[in-house]
């Protein structure tokens, strides 16, 4: 009898009520492997979730989050509110990053600007709420007459951004 059940393919179940013949999964259920004695109910993408992939007889539904939210957790089990760049999500909603921190994404937390001096470099471009600072050569490299094994980089013309 076990051999009969093992012949049932994905998308079916081994029906004990019908002499263990393979019956198709009922609507809104699936079996992703063969030899199953029951089909599982499909996940329901409801409320804050929207359907990314419909359930089929052989695979579960997959959910995504509605606009304004992004997925968290295994298989998008939760939806977290989006914020703008330059903000982070708190218990009370989206808040601007404090001075000295930035967030360049719609999710996650504000992170401190890079401390250029820790690497012996200087700040080339100031940080904002949305962007980290850009570090440039060390102050010593920029001073006139500084000895260096490599020739100094050509000075940038005013108004031109670094590549």
């Amino acid at each position: 009898l076990q051999d009969l059940c093992s012949n049932c393919p994905a998308g079916t179940f081994c029906d004990n009520n019908r002499s263990q013949i393979c019956s198709p999964c009922p609507p809104n259920s699936f079996s992703s492997a063969g030899g199953q004695r029951t089909c599982d109910i499909c996940r329901q993408c409801k409320g804050v979730f929207k359907t990314r992939k419909e359930c089929s007889s052989t695979s579960n539904a997959e959910c995504d989050c509605i606009s304004g939210y992004h997925c968290l957790g295994a298989e998008c089990s939760m939806c977290e509110q989006d914020c703008k760049q330059g903000q982070e999500l708190t218990k009370k909603g989206c808040k601007d990053c404090c001075f000295g921190t930035f967030n360049d994404q719609k999710r996650g937390i504000c992170r401190p600007w890079t401390n250029c001096s820790l690497d012996g470099k200087s700040v080339l471009v100031n940080g904002t709420k949305e962007r980290d600072v850009v570090c440039g050569p060390s102050p010593a490299d920029l001073s006139p007459g500084a000895s260096s094994a490599t020739p100094p980089a050509p000075a940038r013309e005013p108004g031109h951004s670094p590549q």
């Epitope: 409320g47 804050v48 939210y69 298989e75 089990s77």
Partner: antibody, heavy 123, light 106 residues
Framework: EVQLVESGGGLVQPGGSLRLSCAAS??????????VGWIRQAPGKGLEWLAL???????YYSPSLKSRLTISRDNSKNTLYLQLNSLRAEDTAVYYC???????????????WGQGTLVTVSS | DIQLTQSPSSLSASVGDRVTITCRAS??????LAWYQQKPGKAPKLLIY???NLETGVPSRFSGSGSGTDFTLTISSLQPEDFATYYC????????FGQGTKVEIK
């Protein structure tokens, strides 16, 4: 601060109907992602989910009670309603209104609950 | 429908005890499980969501684990205010609650 206040409970005759209200404050029932539902608890028994309506006005019902339940809302009053018809003695319970999800992370759980309203079905 | 079965249905424990409550789903529900605490005459209070995430303001002695069909709520060191009834709830397909576990004073 999120608050849910139920009303409309009381003594009802068998076979009659009831309409419960849940006044929401601290959030809007039509805010994207938010779902608000009804859960009941018979005296000395466990929790039973009844119905839920979400921000997009999609409605979900307990299969065993679907034919007797209607969930609705009035966005202008920020109020949720539950209509239960053909009442029986076994519908005697405290009826809770609850909001799905937490503040900034939303999923299929209930983070905010009202204090409940008692419905007694008896002749 | 998806059924949730909690065990035990009741237990007696002392302050300081480690308490474990299990919840078994009739089929795999991923991590779509929440735990609630309810005291007599009060509304339920959310403790854990998404199987293992502690709700804000809930003491860290509460923890949740599991995925698929088997889930656990653990109270690491039972406090006097923890004597209550605990419910699991799934949100994978519609919403269903377990029958509850009453934690009583030994």
């Amino acid at each position: 601060e999120v608050q849910l206040v139920e009303s409309g409970g009381g003594l009802v005759q068998p076979g009659g109907s009831l309409r419960l209200s849940c006044a929401a404050s601290g959030f809007s029932l039509s805010t994207g992602g938010v779902g608000v539902g009804w859960i009941r608890q018979a005296p000395g028994k466990g929790l039973e989910w009844l119905a839920l309506i979400d921000w997009a006005d999609d409605k979900y019902y307990s299969p065993s009670l679907k034919s007797r339940l209607t969930i609705s809302r009035d966005n202008s009053k920020n109020t949720l309603y539950l209509q239960l018809n053909s009442l029986r003695a076994e519908d005697t319970a405290v009826y809770y209104c609850a909001r799905g999800g937490s503040d900034t992370v939303i999923g299929d759980w209930f983070a905010y609950w009202g204090q409940g309203t008692l419905v007694t079905v008896s002749s | 429908d998806i059924q949730l079965t909690q065990s035990p249905s009741s237990l007696s424990a002392s302050v300081g005890d480690r308490v474990t409550i299990t919840c078994r789903a009739s089929q795999s529900i991923g991590s779509y499980l929440a735990w609630y605490q309810q005291k007599p005459g009060k509304a339920p209070k959310l403790l854990i969501y998404d199987a293992s995430n502690l709700e804000t303001g809930v003491p860290s002695r509460f923890s949740g684990s599991g995925s698929g069909t088997d889930f656990t709520l653990t109270i690491s060191s039972l406090q006097p205010e923890d004597f209550a009834t605990y419910y699991c709830q799934q949100g994978y397909y519609l919403w269903t609650f377990g029958q509850g576990t009453k934690v009583e004073i030994k």
